[in-house]
């Protein structure tokens, strides 16, 4: 039994780091493998993660971490019974994938303005809380070409757009994702999408 693709890990910078790797053949990850992880610190103790299958030869493990700060460094040991298959380390702050924003809501009752709001996925005491920026994706269910991205570079989790920038009388969907420049993170997953019917009063044409 050998590791074909070494574990790569990403952290949500809050409580979970996810590690994925591939074995050289079909493997029952949960029964055959264990990933041990330990914070590099005199008084830390080793924790065991039981991996799950992620495709025939792929494994994924969700490492529980109580909190994360930028200096944290973990040792990782991948075991198959008594055999050490791989040894490495992981610094969560260098591999951050933020949590996806939630509670995306479209408010359509504000005089021809669409107000989109969502929730910051981090509690106020987390470092990322004040460092997230967002991308909002709006698309038409009827017209695949009607697809747009709005970059929200301010901290407030909201976006205002004129309803007239979208077509009237048709349904749209929106979703939002986050990233943090300070840790050069990857983008989060998209939030669940929300749907609304776009309608607004056309301005009177003058002849």
């Amino acid at each position: 039994m050998k590791v074909l693709q070494e574990p790569t890990c990403v952290s949500d910078y809050m409580s979970i780091s996810t590690c994925e790797w591939k074995m050289n053949g079909p493997t029952n990850c949960s029964t055959e493998l264990r990933l041990l992880y330990q914070l590099v610190f005199l008084l830390s103790e080793a924790h065991t993660c039981i991996p799950e299958n992620n495709g025939g030869a792929g494994c994924v493990c969700h490492l529980l971490m109580d909190d994360v700060v930028s200096a944290d460094n973990y040792t990782l040991d991948l075991w198959a019974g008594q055999q050490l298959l791989w040894k490495g380390s992981f610094k969560p702050s260098e591999h951050v994938k933020p949590r996806a924003p939630g509670n995306l809501t479209v408010h359509t009752n504000v005089s021809d303005t669409l107000l989109l709001t969502w929730s910051n996925p981090y509690p106020p005491d987390n470092y990322l809380y004040n460092h997230l920026t967002y991308a909002v994706n709006i698309w038409s269910e009827n017209d695949p070409a009607d697809f747009r991205i709005y970059n929200v570079t301010y901290l407030e989790p909201s976006l205002r757009i004129a309803a007239s920038t979208l077509k009237s009388g048709i349904s749209y969907r929106a979703r939002v994702r986050a990233w943090a420049q300070c840790y050069n993170t990857t983008w989060s997953e998209w939030s669940p999408s929300t749907k609304w019917h776009n309608s607004y009063r056309e301005p009177f044409e003058q002849h």
Epitope: L42, L43, S44, E45, D66, S70, A71
Partner: antibody, heavy 116, light 110 residues
Framework: EVQLLESGGGLVQPGGSLRLSCAVS????????MSWVRQAPGKGLEWVSA????????YYADSVKGRFTISRDNSKNTLYLQMNSLRAEDTAVYYC?????????WGQGTLVTVSS | QSVLTQPPSASGTPGQRVTISCSGS????????VNWYQQLPGTAPKLLIY???HRPSGVPDRFSGSKSGTSASLAISGLRSEDEADYYC???????????FGGGTKLTVL
């Protein structure tokens, strides 16, 4: 809200024993290392002892080694310090502290006075 | 005699910037992260700076920490009367397998 509440301090004669307790709430006690730090009257801070989250790793300052024993009961969210063969120089306020690489939360302390 | 060396006292006037130094060796500051604690009169210590330069939430950005080699320093800008307190540096010492503190610096706001 994180709270650490020390108890068990008091006046004891040289050579005597005392057991300090620290009741913890507001975080998952069993996930974190814990420590005791003391401060003699008018003096600076002195680290006493530390214990890992599961109790598997324990360290002591040379000044208390062989006399003090740190322990924890994760089911009761409580940290303990058993102090034997107490000396006058052990007189101090004893603080329990949540430990990461640093002490991020402290209790208000309990005063131990060793005097005849 | 503390393993880490701090000046016993420091002072400044409101609005001023003051710096407190902390000197150690390769077995402590040189190879570990430095933390700073503030102890206001009659209260328990409080974490002020962790891992050399990071502030816990709620600590004003007037406080900053840095480390170079076997020394560290705490800087307080825009000094205020409520900053009058004892300040301690601390870190792990690999050769002692112990956490070590500086002797503390009493900051007076004139």
């Amino acid at each position: 809200e994180v709270q650490l509440l020390e108890s068990g301090g008091g006046l004891v004669q040289p050579g005597g024993s005392l057991r300090l307790s620290c009741a913890v709430s507001g975080f998952t006690f069993s996930n974190y290392a814990m420590s005791w730090v003391r401060q003699a009257p008018g003096k600076g801070l002195e680290w006493v002892s530390a214990i890992s989250s599961g109790g598997g790793n324990i360290y002591y300052a040379d000044s208390v080694k062989g006399r003090f024993t740190i322990s924890r009961d994760n089911s009761k969210n409580t940290l303990y310090l058993q102090m034997n063969s107490l000396r006058a120089e052990d007189t101090a306020v004893y603080y329990c502290a949540k430990l990461r690489r640093y002490f991020d939360y402290w209790g208000q302390g309990t005063l131990v006075t060793v005097s005849s | 005699q503390s393993v880490l060396t701090q000046p016993p006292s420091a002072s400044g006037t409101p609005g001023q910037r003051v710096t407190i130094s902390c000197s150690g060796s390769s077995s402590n500051i040189g190879n570990n992260y430095v933390n700073w604690y503030q102890q206001l009169p009659g209260t328990a210590p409080k974490l002020l700076i962790y891992d050399n330069s990071h502030r816990p939430s709620g600590v004003p950005d007037r406080f900053s920490g840095s480390k170079s080699g076997t020394s560290a320093s705490l800087a307080i800008s825009g000094l205020r009367s409520e900053d009058e307190a004892d300040y301690y540096c601390g870190t792990w010492d690999a050769s002692l397998s112990a956490y070590v503190f500086g002797g503390g610096t009493k900051l007076t706001v004139l």
